[in-house]
């Protein structure tokens, strides 16, 4: 099959929530926090209660996915992490419920999740060479790599 690319005809179906209420810490041990209603940022926290808690939902397509495809939702909300373009902040998009199917331009809600030991990476399904990343004095954004930080530790059972 073809390498990952933005394919509007691929339909992704929601399967289940695979992780609940976890925190994402970057390689500088900064936690992702809410910057405002629309954006996220990263900060070193003494109290992890201030960190955003995420849920991770798994999707599958009909094309034999090569990687696990996920959606990221802020726990206990209807806000979903949404990719824009390179070096643009990811947005928080409000939706009444988790999408049962995702296709076309809505694939900016989906990410390929990779694990490498304790490090986790989220590449955009809409932009497969771009990662969810933190950047000094900036919002959480999409980036191709350094100087942005693209690897995250998942901290579970923080509730």
């Amino acid at each position: 099959s073809a390498p990952f690319s933005f394919l509007s005809n691929v339909k992704y179906n929601f399967m289940r929530i695979i992780k609940y209420e976890f925190i994402l810490n970057d390689a500088l041990n900064q936690s992702i926090i809410r910057a405002n209603d629309q954006y996220l940022t990263a900060a070193a926290l003494h109290n992890l209660d201030e960190a955003v808690k995420f849920d991770m939902g798994a999707y599958k397509s009909s094309k034999d996915d090569a990687k696990i495809t996920v959606i990221l939702r802020i726990s206990k909300t209807q806000l979903y992490v949404t990719a824009q373009d390179e070096d643009q902040p990811v947005l928080l998009k409000e939706m009444p419920e988790i999408p049962k199917t995702i296709t076309g331009s809505e694939t900016n809600l989906l990410f390929f999740w990779e694990t490498h030991g304790t490090k986790n990476y989220f590449t955009s399904v809409a932009h497969p060479n771009l990662f969810i990343a933190t950047k000094q004095d900036y919002w959480v954004c999409l980036a191709g790599g350094p100087p942005s930080i693209t690897d995250f530790q998942i901290l579970e059972n923080q509730a």
């Epitope: 099959s1 390498p3 289940r16 599958k60 034999d64 696990i68 990779e114 490498h116 990476y121």
Partner: antibody, heavy 114, light 106 residues
Amino acid sequence: QVQLQQPGAELVRPGASVKLSCKASGYTFTTYWMNWVKQRPEQGLEWIGRIDPYDSETLYSQKFKDTAILTVDKSSSTAYMQLSSLTSEDSAVYYCARYGFDYWGQGTTLTVSS
Amino acid sequence: QIVLTQSPALMSASPGEKVTMTCSASSSVNYMYWYQQKPRSSPKPWIYLTSNLASGVPARFSGSGSGTSYSLTISSMEAEDAATYYCQQWNSNPYTFGGGTKLEMK
């Protein structure tokens, strides 16, 4: 810590079947796909297929889709690979590897011999 | 399926020498992954997402490339680097491995 435990060796007769096991620990078994990889003596690595332990959905390499069957037992966090109609060509080391290929079992050496 | 061709199949290097091995893909892939294997041992993750070193991998190793051409480089060969290195893609199904480059110490 994540561990994938495999038996060290299996000896079987040509034409028979064998079920290799891979017991996972240290993580949530149903969250991560499990891969199986073959390595014949002095040769390279071949991906056999993968299974999603949550719903047992499988995907096989074309080469192995008629001879390998991947299953799981969620209650014991164990992945299995059954190989049937064995020949000497199936003599190899078989590895299980977690999604991401970041954790590998020690491998089971399968010897097919009469 | 995507075929990965590694070259050279066998190479030897002296201590301190710079070493480069390549992996060529039959179709473009977004990222390449590399594993180190020593005799009677499981493959170890070595480089992932083209250029990231796995935990515990010495900084003398590096990975680079894009599209159909990727490489693994050792800036200064050491005895413990003698092993077989495999490239792999899991950009598309089926996942595939290269045939390996066996690196020996001179």
